[in-house]
């Protein structure tokens, strides 16, 4: 049952990247409208993003909330220019999305080399720790933050010259690496999140390898 | 539960090659990193290399190095072992393990192994 | 590339008995050191990672610790099914290299 020629949603599907989160759905709004609720498993329903001709619908404001709980949202359609009308069962057509845990599965986003730098046969090799849209105090958290020790990198190294990559990992943003003196090497991280089960690899970084700017050399 | 079930092996003369394949179940490779071990007869284990699934990147034991492939296939689930320019000494049952991603656990899960016997 | 030097290459040993196996990196490698155990005709079990801890569903009589570049493997109390060939392994870098392996054979 449902409101006379309105649709209910359907793929409802969670979009997000270090928390930054958006529900989209389908179909493109033909002479309707949508409404979306959010709740934890516990909690009260709220509403966001009324009356809208889109098909998706920024949650990150509430999921920031508390990462580690498991969201629901529904989307309701309501015909346009009529959002006070109801079905035959006084109830607006909705569809549930599927359950969303943010800490266990938000995607985890392209990560950044913001510096490296040879001392002789040792390179320091440092991720950018980037900053999250979740708050604490007032101020914003970075994945470290968030993560703490379950998250690790993974450094991919390889000479100019060669194919093959070596790895290295870390559960801190720095890596501290042996290489060949006078060798050029190249650079890749991707960040992991090995107790999970499903989106444990974040894509790899863009590569940077010595011998450009972001590299500083000290040989001694 | 994970599985990893490698297949292909047999006899092959020197100088032959041969693909061996290791089926994965109850995980996705991509999530993880997959690596070949090799045992030659009454001998210990070695290193033979490494695949990320997700990026493609490869590392080699020098053994091997420029005479064998590692690759995969997301989409099959499976990672490949392509072994060309084989010698005697490549003679070994060839394992294929998974590697678990974190700085702590290391190969938590292996394949039964599949025997490979290079002679003429 | 790192060495991982083990001894001794074979023992003999009673069940009850508490059995040592040691592995020396050749270089630093952090507390980045695996043990297997492997029985004939079967692929490698993971026992011990990170130096000193137990996988999961492995027995409490086998433990591991390190001392600077030393490993050692410890079974407290020797079973039946512990005779076996073990070996350590080194992921500090990459390549990962394996010891020659202990097998632990019934006296």
């Known amino acids: 049952s449902g409101t006379t020629n309105t649709v209910a949603a359907y793929n409802l599907t969670w979009k997000s990247t270090n928390f930054k989160t958006i529900l989209e759905w389908e179909p493109k709004p033909v002479n309707q409208v949508y409404t979306v609720q959010i709740s934890t498993k516990s909690g009260d329903w709220k509403s966001k993003c009324f009356y809208t001709t889109d098909t998706e619908c920024d949650l990150t404001d509430e999921i920031v909330k508390d990462v580690k709980q498991t969201y629901l949202a529904r989307v309701f359609s309501y015909p346009a220019g009529n959002v006070e009308s109801t079905g035959s069962a006084g109830e607006p057509l909705y569809e549930n999305s599927p359950e969303f845990t943010p800490y266990l599965e938000t995607n985890l986003g392209q990560p950044t080399i913001q510096s490296f730098e040879q001392v002789g046969t040792k390179v320091n090799v440092t991720v950018e720790d980037e900053r999250t849209l979740v708050r604490r105090n007032n101020t914003f958290l970075s994945l470290r933050d968030v993560f703490g020790k379950d998250l690790i990198y993974t450094l991919y190294y390889w000479k100019s010259s060669s194919s093959g990559k070596k790895t290295a990992k870390t559960n801190t943003n720095e890596f501290l690496i042996d290489v060949d003196k006078g060798e050029n090497y190249c650079f890749s991280v991707q960040a992991v999140i090995p107790s999970r089960t499903v989106n444990r690899k974040s894509t790899d970084s863009p590569v940077e390898c010595m011998g450009q700017e972001k590299g500083e050399f000290r040989e001694i | 539960e994970v599985q990893l079930v490698e297949s292909g092996g047999g006899l092959v003369q020197p100088g032959g090659s041969l693909r061996l394949s290791c089926a994965a179940s109850?995980?996705?490779?991509?999530?993880?990193?997959i690596h070949w071990v090799r045992q030659a007869p009454g001998k210990g284990l070695e290193w033979v290399g490494y695949i990320d699934p997700a990026n493609g990147f490869t590392y080699y034991a020098d053994s091997v190095k420029g005479r064998f492939t590692i690759s995969a296939d997301t989409s099959k689930n499976t990672a490949y072992l392509q072994m060309n320019s084989l010698r005697a000494e490549d003679t070994a049952v060839y394992y294929c393990a998974r590697d678990y991603g974190s700085i702590q656990v290391f190969l938590d899960y292996w394949g039964q192994g599949t025997l490979v016997t290079v002679s003429s | 590339d790192i060495q991982m030097t083990q001894s001794p290459s074979s023992l003999s040993a009673s069940v009850g008995d508490r059995v040592t196996i040691t592995c020396r990196a050749s270089?630093?490698?952090?507390?980045?050191v695996a043990w297997y155990q492997q029985k004939p005709g079967k692929a490698p079990k993971l026992l011990i990672y990170?130096?000193?801890f137990l996988y999961s569903g492995v027995p409490s009589r086998f433990s591991g610790s390190r001392s600077g570049t030393d490993f050692t493997l410890t079974i407290s109390s020797l079973q039946p099914e512990d005779f076996a060939t073990y070996y350590c392994q080194q992921h500090y870098t990459t390549p990962p290299t394996f010891g020659q392996g202990t097998k632990v054979e019934i006296k």
């Open positions: 270089q630093d490698v952090n507390t980045a």
């Open positions: 990170s130096a000193s």
């Open positions: 109850g995980f996705t490779i991509s999530g993880y990193w």
